[in-house]
Interface confidence: medium
Amino acid sequence: SEGRKTWRRRGQQPPPPPRTEAAPAAGQPVESFPLDFTAVEGNMDSFMAQVKSLAQSLYPCSAQQLNEDLRLHLLLNTSVTCNDGSPAGYYLKESRGSRRWLLFLEGGWYCFNRENCDSRYDTMRRLMSSRDWPRTRTGTGILSSQPEENPYWWNANMVFIPYCSSDVWSGASSKSEKNEYAFMGALIIQEVVRELLGRGLSGAKVLLLAGSSAGGTGVLLNVDRVAEQLEKLGYPAIQVRGLADSGWFLDNKQYRHTDCVDTITCAPTEAIRRGIRYWNGVVPERCRRQFQEGEEWNCFFGYKVYPTLRCPVFVVQWLFDEAQLTVDNVHLTGQPVQEGLRLYIQNLGRELRHTLKDVPASFAPACLSHEIIIRSHWTDVQVKGTSLPRALHCWDRSLHDSHKASKTPLKGCPVHLVDSCPWPHCNPSCPTVRDQFTGQEMNVAQFLMHMGFDMQTVAQPQGLEPSELLGMLSNGS
């Protein structure tokens, strides 16, 4: 059904409509506001058709804006480097009419000792070196400049910061005779911000530091430091916010304990503990003050660092995150899931939901997936009838309407959206799952049966017969 699309690649989309911009008065940049969907919630297709038609009718005025690509800029300060000593950098697409800046931190796991960093360099060099980076990148999802694909912030200045430090954006050590690799994630962010100030960021009203997976954790680790940096550099009026996607991990007990041999099997607490030492990792000051020396690894876990942050942060997290399951040694191999594992997975969702209870701005669908915000179909998933772009819009409004962080949400504009149904893919808008071996799409009913859920058990709390539930799930309702 339409509600449960697989994530499609951007290349399969129709050509983008041109972007429209208001003419700035007397050379002044004009603030662009996010689209307010309150009045059109019930008829989004018609509204989007009108936006597209308007954009196309204004095409002659803005043909020069048609290029969707973000362009690579290697850092001028070449002492701030990727793991192998090549200069770090960023991809930028400016939007002159906007005072909103989106800085996106890429994800891609980490390495925490010489052996697994060597292995990573052999197999995933792009995540450790800038030598082979392409000149341009296409902005997708929240980085897209198309209102259809990005109804949230399509008109913002878009910055994609590639991950080439393998340190969860926390490192502060350079390459030397003693250190085979540089780990400068935290310094790369600071240097990118410094260089962007000369490219228009100085006039920003809002800087949204976003990231997915390791980049999402990177947001939690760096958002306050970016705010402090801008304040010290004399730009206190720029409001810094965070958007952490798929980076809110739990330091829970693994399903099966394994020794810390490589990145994937090592328990996250142990991997980060070793990593911090190897990277010379830095964590937010206010969090560090709450843990003994040597216990800074705690600050890599969202539910521990979040209460110490000062900048507003919106947390996006699948309740059944694939990376979390991987580090917990849960591998869904195509064999039906045994009861012990099924209970473990359900409990993981319950624990994650609990950690988000005091996070006012959060979006957590009950799906088995990983990352969302730069996927082209990031608009498809809904929690309690609200999509992620809509929730982010409501968050913007709540921050704009009141700097008071009031606990009362705007009427009809929710920002705390956490699924309460208890099993993976009980939310019909979840992205479609594929069988890992055949590549075949599975509908929710097939997936749940594959996961070992007894349909009687699942149907009972809903007050349904198993056959009724199967019918509903098969139709994607």
Epitope: D224, A227, E228, L230, E231, P236, A237, I238, Q239, V240, R289, Q290, F291, Q292, E295, N298, K304, Y306, P307, R310, C311, P312, D358, H403, K404, A405
Partner: antibody
Framework: QVQLKESGPGLVAPSQSLSITCTVS????????VQWVRQPPGKGLEWLGV???????NYNSALMFRLSISKDNSKSQVFLKMNSLQTDDTAMYYC????????????WGQGTLAPVS | DIVMSQSPSSLAVSVGEKVTMSCKSS????????????LAWYQQKPGQSPKLLIY???TRESGVPDRFTGSGSGTDFTLTISSVKAEDLAVYYC??????????FGGGTKLEIK
Amino acid sequence: QVQLKESGPGLVAPSQSLSITCTVSEFSLNSYGVQWVRQPPGKGLEWLGVIWAGGITNYNSALMFRLSISKDNSKSQVFLKMNSLQTDDTAMYYCARSYNYDVVFAYWGQGTLAPVS
Amino acid sequence: DIVMSQSPSSLAVSVGEKVTMSCKSSQSLLYSSNQKNYLAWYQQKPGQSPKLLIYWASTRESGVPDRFTGSGSGTDFTLTISSVKAEDLAVYYCQQYYSYPPYTFGGGTKLEIK
């Protein structure tokens, strides 16, 4: 709902030490910090110190050499110990807990009076 | 340390009157990145523990009557009670949580009912 309850020894002789226990319920000391505040009779509030979820302590610098805060997570108890008491340490001693985002004292114990004489 | 000063130290008003009390900090409590003022107000009735009324300088704690309003930014803050009731007899304290240690309180304003 969240509760904190202080229990102390009552009267303390000058130069002796004061020990107060704060027993909490409906939340975990693994997740929240607990603060100590005191109030001399007829006077204002003075922040003494905090023990964070991770076990780190911060103290009011004016008192830090006489003060020690510890906890037992499994018993849901936080302990305040203050040495070398003088008569001007006579006060109502409160433990308090913050919200999960920043340090406002949202939940307070009923306090325990510690007269020094 | 940030020093908090409250004025007046006491005031007496009749039921139904409007009351304002002031709190000043020795340095700004506004954190520009999130535009929040790190200031709270507490009410302490005779023989009771303090109770949180307002945080972020102007956000009312749930359950607090809307006659209590916090305002101000930077270094100057005000607590206003729009129409005093007899049960508002208490000492009111402001507290900064911008910088620690230590968190610091003002000396208090005692509200008496005529």
